[in-house]
């Protein structure tokens, strides 16, 4: 709130309560107990005439305040700017239900500039005014005042003048400033066309059409026309003058873009500095050339910086969990200046003896959320083989990677999946059968899934049906089972163990011991 009042060129002030010398002397109803004229001091110790009311205790408040008569000076639409402070009812204990946080704004058109009384029924409501969230904090000397500013418009007006009125319905409020003004569209040069001073139309939708003329060295796209809107702003809905590509408006003329600048199209924009990592070497450039090693993607606008592929991802961390691997990494140090970065995962299965002999993992491996086009910096890879060397490469790619593929864009890690329990043994054979013993042999499991630590042979008499069994363990792929009963059917199962545990037992092998002391050599799955 200041003493000197500066307003926009398109506003003509009809009333400014801050400019009134001495008391405002507006009419209040009721005369006492309602609106009250109170002086507050501004930062220059000059009194500001305000109107205040704070009747928040009593319900059904109806306090009116009316301005003096305001001439409209031929304006058909006027604007009312109210600066006010409105107290939050929450800061007033015990007034729920009676305290309000709004007031009402009214007007009344009249040719009579000396009406002495407020006749409420003559007034037309403009709006209910509330304190919005966006208040201004204004220094009043060494104090702070929260000022809300609200603007409303009224029209079309037809009589010589009008009165404004403020109705309080139970708020705690101070009107600090009331300003009434109308708008005009001032003389302007816009878009290389000149338009004369023009008075606004009658209502919010009325536009006054004005034809403009192009300045030198510009081309007419369409006939330049502007419309003077009711808010005093020039509008350009159709037609304009434009500088050619490679040229810009400077000092009201269209001049060639300077070296290092460009303009791609015939628009009313100014020449733009060449985007980062690009240059122009002549005046009047319509685009800029990318620096060496930098590129533009097909869908990049001329205004976008030239960019490059990203550097390699950083800090690749692997976490092996049996036959799954979780990979996590950090964004590249250099994204190439682009936002469209994504990541691709390459999986290679490598031989234990020669890690350089790697081949693609194939379709059996699964990636979560996906293998290519990852937007996150982590991936989970499952369905790997146990106890196997894998190399994973994480490639960072962006919209210009295809123009300059570069191995630096990837980071790799080699991991070995954990040992797992071995698969079951496919073939168990009885190599030698006697009255009291059976010699067994078997093959290593198809998938050892680690280092085989030992084999476990479980056997029992067939008619015992596994109710009573014995266990023999051996590191070899064969064993002699002794102490058997003659002429008895035995069932044998074998399983392998790695550090990760036992595999499944083999299919049962049924063998019957001999009655005579000779040896039977067998190599079938079921010796009898």
């Amino acid at each position: 709130v200041t003493g000197s009042r500066v307003y926009p060129a398109n506003e003509v002030t009809l009333l400014d309560s801050r400019s009134v010398q001495g008391e405002l002397g507006w009419i209040a109803s009721p005369l006492e107990g309602g609106w009250e004229e109170v002086s507050i001091m501004d930062e220059k110790n000059t009194p500001i005439r305000t109107y205040q009311v704070c009747n928040v205790m009593e319900p059904s408040q109806n306090n009116w305040l009316r301005t003096d008569w305001i001439t409209r000076e031929g304006a058909q639409r006027v604007y009312i700017e109210i600066k006010f402070t409105l107290r939050d009812c929450n800061s007033l204990p015990g007034v729920m239900g009676t305290c309000k946080e709004t007031f009402n704004l009214y007007y009344y058109e009249s040719d009579n500039d000396k009406e002495r009384f407020i006749r409420e029924n003559q007034f037309v409501k403009i709006d209910t005014i509330a304190a919005d969230e966006s208040f201004t904090q204004v220094d009043i000397g060494d104090r702070i005042m929260k000022l809300n500013t609200e603007i409303r418009d009224v029209g079309p007006l037809s009589k010589k003048g009008f009165y404004l009125a403020f109705q309080d319905v139970g708020a705690c409020i101070a009107l600090v400033s009331v300003r009434v003004f109308y708008k005009k569209c001032p003389l302007t040069v816009r878009n290389l066309a000149q338009f004369p001073d023009t008075i606004t139309g009658a209502d919010t939708s009325s536009l006054v059409e004005v034809r403009g003329s192009c300045v030198n060295n510009s081309e007419e796209k369409d006939v330049p026309k502007m419309y003077c809107g009711a808010d005093g702003e020039w509008l350009v809905p159709i037609g304009n003058c434009l500088c050619n590509a490679g040229h810009e408006e400077r000092s009201g003329e269209c001049q060639a873009c300077k070296i290092g600048y460009y303009k791609a199209l015939s628009t009313d924009a100014t020449c733009a500095k060449c985007p980062p990592h690009s240059y122009s070497v002549w005046e009047g450039a319509t685009s800029c050339t990318c620096d060496r090693g930098f590129f533009r993607a097909d869908n990049d606008a001329a205004s976008m910086p030239c960019t490059r592929p990203p550097s390699a991802p950083l800090n690749l961390i692997s976490n092996v969990n049996e036959t799954s691997v979780n990979l996590e990494w950090s964004s590249p140090q250099n994204t190439g200046g682009r936002q469209d970065i994504s990541y691709n995962v390459v999986c290679k299965k490598c031989g234990a003896g020669d890690p350089s002999k790697c081949r693609p993992c194939g379709s059996g491996v699964h990636y979560t959320p996906q293998q290519n086009g990852l937007k996150t910096t982590k991936v989970s890879i499952t369905d790997l083989l146990a106890h196997t060397n894998y190399t994973f490469e994480i490639w960072a790619v962006n919209g210009v990677s295809k123009y300059n593929p570069n191995p630096d864009q990837s980071v790799s890690v080699t991991v070995t999946t954990n040992q797992a329990a071995p698969s079951s043994i496919a073939l168990v054979q009885a190599k030698e059968v006697t009255r009291y013993s059976v010699a067994l042999a078997w093959l290593e499991p198809d998938r050892p899934n680690g280092v085989i630590l030992e084999y476990e042979v479980k056997y029992y008499e067939k008619d015992q049906n596994e109710r009573s069994y014995r266990i023999v363990r051996t590191a070899a792929r064969n064993t002699d089972i002794k102490g058997l009963n003659p002429l008895t059917s035995y069932v044998f199962h074998v399983r392998a163990r790695t550090a990760a545990g036992y595999g499944d037992f083999s299919e049962p092998l049924e063998v019957t011991t001999n009655t005579v002391p000779s040896r039977i050599i067998g190599d079938g799955a079921n010796s009898t």
Partner: antibody, heavy 121, light 106 residues
Framework: QVQLLQSGAEVKKPGASVKVPCKAS????????MSWVRQAPGQGLEWMGW????????TYAQGFTGRFVFSLDTSVSTAYLQISSLKAEDTAVYYC??????????????WGQGTLVTVSS | EIVLTQSPATLSVSPGERATLSCRAS??????PAWYQQKPGQAPRLLIY???TRATGIPDRFSASGSGTDFTLTISRVEPEDFAVYYC????????FGQGTKVEIK
């Protein structure tokens, strides 16, 4: 002339109750809230709360809930402060004061002369 | 709850001198405190409220200023009748008083 008239001094025993009246005159009683303020001997002012004289809705400050009750009789423009289960530490001058509300800040613009309540066995 | 701290506890001044009383809030407040004067055996009297508005009948030698957390009551030229205890009071959903500053004759 706007006035708030309070009753004379009261001497009460611990555990008793006291009801201090505050009679308003010279303005519309229901248009302004009434505050109550306590001042113990040789001490500063303590705001106890206020009552909306229009709705009868009371607001109590911290430490003044439970034993303290604000009430009204608008027919005789009187506000009351009742204190029950009196304790020795309730000994103080109790003031009623009319509340002046404005958008820029509040105050208590008219005060009663105060009622001294002494609690002693 | 906002705590108001007044300083000094006692201020010794001679008649005709300027007296400056301080009131500091424990946290920033959006409003100015009210100021009261209390003489021995009397009820407090409202001096200033709102945007440093003097209450009815208060002479213009009393003025208030400040914002945020630091507020000041100034008596430009102390008169004999001004020797009393002065309290600041913050408004809001809960009101609080400062502990008071006693202005005494030097």
């Amino acid at each position: 002339q706007v006035q708030l008239l309070q009753s004379g001094a009261e001497v009460k025993k611990p555990g008793a109750s006291v009801k201090v009246p505050c009679k308003a005159s010279g303005y519309t009683f229901t248009s302004r809230a009434m505050s109550w303020v306590r001042q113990a001997p040789g001490q500063g002012l303590e705001w106890m709360g206020w009552i909306n004289t229009n709705t009868g809705n009371p607001t109590y400050a911290q430490g003044f809930t439970g034993r303290f009750v604000f009430s009204l009789d608008t027919s005789v423009s009187t506000a009351y402060l009742q204190i029950s289960s009196l304790k020795a530490e309730d000994t103080a001058v109790y003031y009623c004061a009319r509340v002046r509300l404005t958008v820029y800040g509040d105050g208590m613009d008219v005060w009663g002369q105060g009622t001294l309540v002494t609690v002693s066995s | 709850e906002i705590v108001l701290t007044q300083s000094p506890a006692t201020l010794s001044v001679s008649p005709g001198e300027r007296a400056t009383l301080s009131c500091r809030a424990s946290q920033s407040v959006s409003s100015n405190p009210a100021w009261y004067q209390q003489k021995p055996g009397q009820a407090p009297r409202l001096l200033i409220y709102g945007l440093s508005t003097r209450a009815t009948g208060i002479p213009d030698r009393f003025s208030a200023s400040g914002s945020g957390t630091d507020f000041t009551l100034t008596i430009s030229r102390v008169e004999p009748e001004d020797f009393a205890v002065y309290y600041c009071q913050q408004y809001g959903p809960s009101w609080t008083f400062g502990q008071g500053t006693k202005v005494e004759i030097k």
